[in-house]
């Protein structure tokens, strides 16, 4: 039969005051029959911490259900940790005996010491927006942790990033430490809905890392593409010209029409739609009166997006003599 091993995987467990500490202990065999107890310290002066009776130790709960027949996990959780709880904890197997149980085997022990949790990571993006294909920097900061060892990872939409630099300060001994990391992210045109995540893992977090996020929508500017087209159908003596502004972000946009260089003040119909990737499309319709037009009408659709330099597209209106002479009998 397999010899019983008492496994306490952590040599050191760092916990914060007021929080809950998990002390792990698993056994490799169900034999011999008998309970597993927890003690702090060794020798005759050791202190019983847990004896499978909550009434004796109200701050202690178990991770697994000890009533299950094949249970081999005797890990415990101690709530509301105070400085008085520090010390080395041992899980100890007893063999059922008469008149009393006999100590059979002890685990190697886990030292519980006080640490400090890192603060929630704060992720900051660039001050100004940047267009796709360019690189932007994001910073992540977390403070107040102890001990100094800490792991920081960056993700973009769940994919781990590798282009980042991290510093932990101070370099020498301190009561608490801070971490600052800067990640470089190449923007893609579809990144309006993307997120960068900074993940911080620390021994005091008991396997549950802290995360800070930033939306790339705050950092990206997707410039629009413009297309001006003339509708083949005439409405009476008017021709409909369409300016399609496609795939832009953010929504901030000013559109103006010019006729032969003169800015048109009159109202135009328009629609704004949102694409699946978070970018927008804007369509503007402009009705040109052709009853008294010369042949050389040039229409310009000018777009100023997010405070950038205006871009424009021109269209030389094609108005046939036949169209001009036609009586305006079409219903508007």
């Amino acid at each position: 039969e397999e010899e019983l091993q008492m496994i306490q995987p952590e040599k050191l467990l760092l916990v914060t005051v007021g929080k809950t500490a998990t002390l792990h202990c698993t056994v490799t065999s169900l034999l011999p029959v008998g309970p597993v107890l927890w003690f702090r310290g060794v020798g005759p002066g050791r202190e019983l911490i847990y004896n499978q009776k909550e009434g004796h130790f109200p701050r202690v709960t178990t991770v697994s259900d000890l009533t299950k027949r094949n249970n081999m996990d005797f890990s415990i959780r101690i709530s509301s940790i105070t400085p008085a709880d520090v010390g080395t904890y041992y899980c100890v197997k007893f063999r059922k005996g008469s008149p009393e149980n006999v100590e059979f085997k002890s685990g190697p022990g886990t030292e519980m010491a006080l640490g400090a949790k890192p603060s929630a990571p704060v992720v900051l993006g660039p001050a100004a927006r940047t267009t796709p294909e360019h690189t932007v920097s994001f910073t992540c900061e977390s403070h107040g942790f102890s001990p100094r060892d800490i792991t920081l990872k960056w993700f973009k939409n769940g994919n781990e990033l590798s282009d980042f630099q991290t510093n932990v300060d101070p370099t020498g001994q301190s009561v608490a430490y801070s971490i600052r990391s800067t990640a470089r992210v190449v923007l893609d045109p579809w990144d309006v809905r993307s997120q960068v995540i900074c993940e911080v893992a620390h021994v005091t977090l008991q396997g549950d890392p802290l995360r800070g996020t930033a939306n790339l929508s705050e950092a990206i500017r997707v410039p629009p593409t413009l297309e001006v087209t003339q509708q083949p159908m005439r409405v009476g003596n008017q021709v409909n010209v369409t300016c399609q502004v496609r795939k832009f972000y953010p929504q901030s946009l000013q559109l103006t029409w010019s006729e032969n260089g003169n800015v048109c003040q009159r109202e135009t119909a328009s629609t704004l739609t949102e694409n699946k990737d978070g970018t927008y499309n804007w369509t503007s319709w402009f009705l040109v009166n052709i009853s008294d037009q010369r042949d050389d009408v040039v229409l310009t659709c000018q777009v100023k997006h997010d405070g950038q330099l205006a871009v424009s597209k021109r269209l030389a209106l094609e108005v046939t003599v036949h169209q001009k002479d036609q009586s305006s009998d079409a219903t508007p």
Epitope: T20, Q52, E54, G55, T61
Partner: antibody, heavy 119, light 111 residues
């Protein structure tokens, strides 16, 4: 079967104290700690604290320190909670609750004791 | 303290339909692969009754119509199909950190 029997409703004047009891039966009383929970509107359910029934060591929610005092009488398998200097804010239903084994959820509850503080 | 926010505050569901109640924690209630989130049902004039423990484990004697899911900060209690006897207020509770805290409750009614 496990039963937690609580004392009856109390109508008390502001400024006085009240002591609510909870008698455990159907199990070994000192094997399980006793928790106390307050239910009032609009604050939903609030954990007051827990007392070890064997040694009588009590641990309180910070919000109830100085307000609630938990004690046990092993001989009668009864847990007590005294509420001091009562105000209208203390008007609520108070429950005692017990966990299953050394689990971390409340498997058994008393029927509740309604405490009404009124002049 | 960990704050638990339940939504909706109340919901009306037709008999035989699915009811979904959400509970969001102000910080993660997971530790070493366990989710320390539990669900209770409370009917008028009665104490709370345990339905689900550790996010997804059905308490003994509770019908399989009740199920729980979720991890870290987002948890869900699902009742499918809803029966007339399910009219009650449902509470989530975390035990990852002291003090244990409860959600504000969700009142379930029949349409």
């Amino acid at each position: 079967q496990v039963q937690l029997q609580q004392s009856g409703a109390e109508l008390v004047r502001p400024g006085v104290s009240v002591k609510v009891s909870c008698k455990g039966s159907g199990y070994t009383f000192t094997d399980y700690a006793m928790h106390w929970v307050k239910q009032s509107h609009p604050k939903s359910l609030e954990w007051i604290g827990v007392i070890g029934t064997y040694y009588g060591d009590a641990y309180y929610n910070q919000n109830f320190k100085g307000k609630a005092t938990m004690t046990v009488d092993k001989s009668s398998s009864t847990a007590y909670m005294e509420l001091a200097r009562l105000t209208s804010e203390d008007s609520a239903i108070y429950y005692c609750a017990r966990r299953a084994g050394t689990s971390d959820w409340f498997a058994y509850w008393g029927q509740g004791t309604l405490v009404t503080v009124s002049a | 303290n960990i704050v638990l926010t339940q939504s909706p505050a109340s919901l009306a569901v037709s008999l035989g339909q699915r009811a979904t109640i959400s509970c969001r924690a102000s910080e993660s209630v997971d530790s070493y692969g366990n989710s320390f989130m539990h669900w209770y049902q409370q009917k008028p004039g009665q104490p709370p009754k345990l339905l689900i423990y550790r996010a997804s484990n059905l308490e003994s004697g509770i019908p399989a119509r009740f199920s729980g899911s979720g991890s870290r900060t987002d948890f869900t209690l699902t009742i499918n199909p809803v029966e007339a006897d399910d009219v009650a207020t449902y509470y989530c509770q975390q035990s990852n950190e002291d003090p244990p805290t409860f959600g504000g409750g969700t009142k379930l009614e029949i349409k």
